[in-house]
Interface confidence: medium
């Protein structure tokens, strides 16, 4: 049978031929009667055999990493007979490893993100190198990792390539680090080969910084004419963090939040100071408010960085605006008796300049020929007043600053003209009536009523009487009904159209004013010829008859 040992050939041998081993048949007695042959891939080119002895040689430099074993076939032939002495047999030549490959990092580039302020031991990333040498051949492919750059912040586990944090890092001081890792084979022993890789480690932000005001004092101004809601200025805090960790909220400390407010512009991260309540320079010309700023999002575990909110003082000066005069009252109502003489006192109005300058005020009454006003605000009559023409005056008073005539205020002025008893009562209409010739005594001729243009505090009460002459010598009499009316009655029987066609009766009407006023009013009575039926009459004046609607023949 065949006799051989396992065949090994070291890779990378530079000699022209390298003896690997011997193939032989146990029938071979060494007399050179056998011939050995090599068949298969590499036979003749990579490996040759001594046909007489069966010695195998490698005639080429081999690379295990390219091919680590060769499977060949061997034949042995009896030279004399040309027949195979042994059956053809397969055998293996293994290429043995030498440390001719350095470790290589195949997954480059390496990049990792880790939160800033992470504690020691936090895993960052694992790097892995590979070595093409034979892992089963000694230490040729056994690797050790070490840190060439990155101390003191990072460390690498020698056997796993796991990178860990070894010292806390602050993103606000440095936000990324380049770490260089070396992998050495031969577990670092002399003659080891090495490879390196770079790892970019970026620190992600955590909210470890509170916002801080850029200024300890801000100065702002607001006009006293500014409406509520006006933005009067901005304040700004800065936060070394980024993204949502730098989002902040501004507020006013409780005591100071009556007049102003602060809203946050979340795009610019500025605080906008807003006027919450109108200000008045003359009441308070400056304000001090204390503002504070806090982060919008602070996780519980990071509250230790945010114990005291940053504060700032805002000094707000109110700017004076020239304001129009201010009347003491929103409107004035005065009373004055009618018929008072020109120049009579009506009342006093008063306006003042609300500004600290206290400009003198000039007054005027718009569109009035009846009243005057002087620079003291005293109103007097410029004409006599007649309540029966106008009982109320609805006017407008204007106050103007002496040194700035554009500053004007106007308010309503109502003047009531009070009544005096300056009108006697009169007939409510013109009375003209008739009496029949055949009228009897006590016959009602006419009911009369009166009016008085004066205003009465109580109800008007009129008193009716005949004049003295008519009382003494009258064909008629009067009865006062006590209701501001009276009736005229005949005081005799029978009248004569031809002798006395018309009577003029003087009626006195007195009012109940103090003093009482009396007027004399004439009642005209025509004598008419009346038929028995009363359907036809003849009077002196046909017009009268027609106007009274009587039929005529």
């Amino acid at each position: 049978g065949w006799v051989w040992n396992q065949f090994f050939v070291p890779e990378e041998m530079n000699t022209t031929s390298h003896h690997i081993g011997q193939l032989r048949s146990d029938l071979d007695n060494g007399n050179n009667s056998f011939q050995y042959k090599l068949l298969g891939a590499g036979a003749g080119s990579t490996f040759i055999i001594d046909e007489r002895t069966g010695d195998i040689y490698a005639i080429q430099k081999l690379d295990r990493e390219e091919r680590s074993l060769y499977i060949l076939r061997a034949q042995v032939i009896d030279i004399a007979t040309g027949r195979a002495v042994e059956p053809e047999s397969e055998f293996v030549i293994k290429v043995s490893d030498i440390n001719d490959n350095e470790p290589k990092f195949l997954d480059e580039p390496y990049e990792a993100i880790v939160p800033e302020m992470s504690p020691e031991g936090t895993l960052v990333i694992q790097v892995t190198a590979s070595d093409a040498d034979d892992p089963s051949s000694g230490n040729n492919a056994r690797l050790l990792y070490s840190l060439l750059q990155g101390q003191p912040y990072f460390s690498v586990e020698p056997t796993t390539g796991v990178i860990r944090i070894s010292s806390k890092m602050d993103r606000e001081l440095q936000d990324e680090y380049w770490v260089i890792i070396q992998a050495k084979d031969m577990i670092g022993q002399p003659g080891a080969l090495s490879g390196t890789t770079s790892v970019l480690i970026k620190l992600s932000d955590v909210n470890d910084n509170k916002p801080i005001f850029k200024e300890s004092l801000y100065r702002l101004t607001v006009s006293e004419s500014a409406p509520t809601g006006t933005s009067i200025g901005t304040i700004m805090a800065y936060d070394n963090d980024i993204g949502e960790n730098a989002e902040m909220d501004y507020s006013i400390e409780e005591d100071d939040s009556q007049t102003f407010d602060i809203i946050t512009n979340h795009e610019t991260q500025e605080g906008i100071v807003i006027l919450k309540k109108k200000v008045d320079f003359e009441h308070q010309n400056h304000y001090g408010i204390r503002a504070k700023v806090k982060n919008h999002h602070v996780p519980e575990q990071l509250m230790k960085y945010h114990t005291e909110a940053s504060t700032t003082f805002i000094k707000i000066q109110v700017e004076d605006v020239d304001e129009p005069p201010l009347f003491l009252l929103p409107y004035y109502v005065f009373e004055v008796f009618e018929e008072t003489p020109q120049g009579s006192f009506v009342g006093v109005v008063s306006a003042t300049d609300p500004d600290n300058r206290k400009s003198p005020i000039r007054y005027s009454i718009t569109r009035s020929k009846v009243f005057n006003i002087n620079d003291n605000g005293t109103i007097t009559t410029s004409n006599s007043l007649d309540r029966e023409i106008s009982a109320w005056y609805n006017l407008s008073i204007t106050a103007t600053e002496k040194y700035n005539i554009e500053q004007i205020s106007s308010i309503p002025l109502y003047v009531q003209v009070l009544n005096i008893n300056d009108h006697a009562p009169e007939f409510s209409q013109y009375y003209e009536t008739y009496v029949c010739e055949n009228a009897g005594s006590g016959q009602v001729i006419q009911t009369i009523s009166a009016v008085d243009r004066d205003e009465s505090i109580e109800e008007h009460h009129f008193y009716f009487n005949l004049s003295v002459e008519d009382t003494n010598n009258s064909s008629f009499t009067i009865i006062d009904n006590q209701d501001n009316t009276a009736v005229i009655l005949t005081n005799r029987t029978g009248f004569n159209l031809q002798e006395e066609p018309v009577f003029y009766i003087s009626i006195l009407i007195a009012d109940n004013g103090i003093p009482s006023l009396t007027s004399t009013n004439t009642l005209t009575i025509h004598v008419c010829d009346c038929g028995d039926s009363g359907s036809t009459q003849t009077c002196q004046y046909q017009e009268l008859v027609l106007s009274m609607g009587f039929k005529t023949e």
Epitope: R219, Q258, Q284, G288, F313, K315, Q317
Partner: antibody, heavy 119, light 107 residues
Framework: QVQLVESGGGVVQPGGSLRLSCAAS????????MDWVRQTPGKGLEWVAV????????YYADSVRGRFTISRDNSKNTLFLQMNSLRVEDTAVYYC????????????WGRGTLVTVSS | EIVLTQSPGTLSLSPGERATLSCRAS???????LAWYQQKPGQAPRLLIY???SRATGIPDRFSGSGSGTDFTLTISRLEPEDFAVYYC????????FGQGTKVEIK
């Protein structure tokens, strides 16, 4: 050291004028609002005027508005008070005072300069 | 304007005694914007207290301020010889006004 020194006081007739100066040293003058405060035996301490750190705003007490003018020269670290149309009641010791950075009280005062208005 | 009234006008005490000075405002002083000053003859006023109760830099802790709204107090716990002077309160919440002063004199 940190100090304020007033000068320019004196005796003046009613209707006359005076210009007071206040020299600042030892601190960043241009960062502070500055005031004038006067002291009379009758009325005690009375605030007169304030000027903001950069001169952009000036405010006066009612009693002096229109007659007094406050100004400053930050390049020379000096505060001024121009007093015109002086009245007898303006007689007082005039102090310049520094407002604090966070409020309106006065943390630094000068020694004062006496202004006497008399006929 | 806010009128500040100090009482008493004069306080006669001996060194080592406690001094209590009062300052009353005619209307509420916003956010306790009240300061106390000390003035010695021929000298400028010196800031003692601001914000009603905060001690100014370099002021000994025997000086303390309290109060809010309209009533404020300056207390000197143990009078030292150098504490005899005139004390003024000042409000700075609405313009600037001072009290008329309280003189602390040696008994």
């Amino acid at each position: 050291q940190v100090q304020l020194v007033e000068s320019g006081g004196g005796v003046v007739q009613p209707g006359g004028s005076l210009r007071l100066s206040c020299a600042a040293s030892g601190f960043s003058f241009s960062s502070y609002d500055m005031d004038w405060v006067r002291q009379t035996p009758g009325k005690g301490l009375e605030w007169v005027a304030v000027i903001w750190y950069d001169g952009s705003n000036k405010y006066y007490a009612d009693s002096v508005r229109g007659r007094f003018t406050i100004s400053r020269d930050n390049s020379k670290n000096t505060l001024f008070l121009q007093m015109n149309s002086l009245r007898v009641e303006d007689t007082a010791v005039y102090y310049c005072a520094r407002e604090t950075g966070e409020g309106w009280y006065f943390d630094l005062w000068g020694r004062g300069t006496l202004v006497t208005v008399s006929s | 304007e806010i009128v500040l009234t100090q009482s008493p006008g004069t306080l006669s005490l001996s060194p080592g005694e406690r001094a209590t000075l009062s300052c009353r405002a005619s209307q509420s002083v916003s956010s306790s914007y009240l300061a106390w000053y000390q003035q010695k003859p021929g000298q400028a006023p010196r800031l003692l207290i601001y914000g009603a109760s905060s001690r100014a830099t370099g002021i000994p802790d025997r000086f303390s301020g309290s109060g809010s709204g309209t009533d404020f107090t300056l207390t000197i716990s143990r009078l030292e010889p150098e504490d005899f002077a005139v004390y003024y309160c000042q409000q700075y919440g609405s313009s600037w006004t001072f009290g008329q002063g309280t003189k602390v004199e040696i008994k």
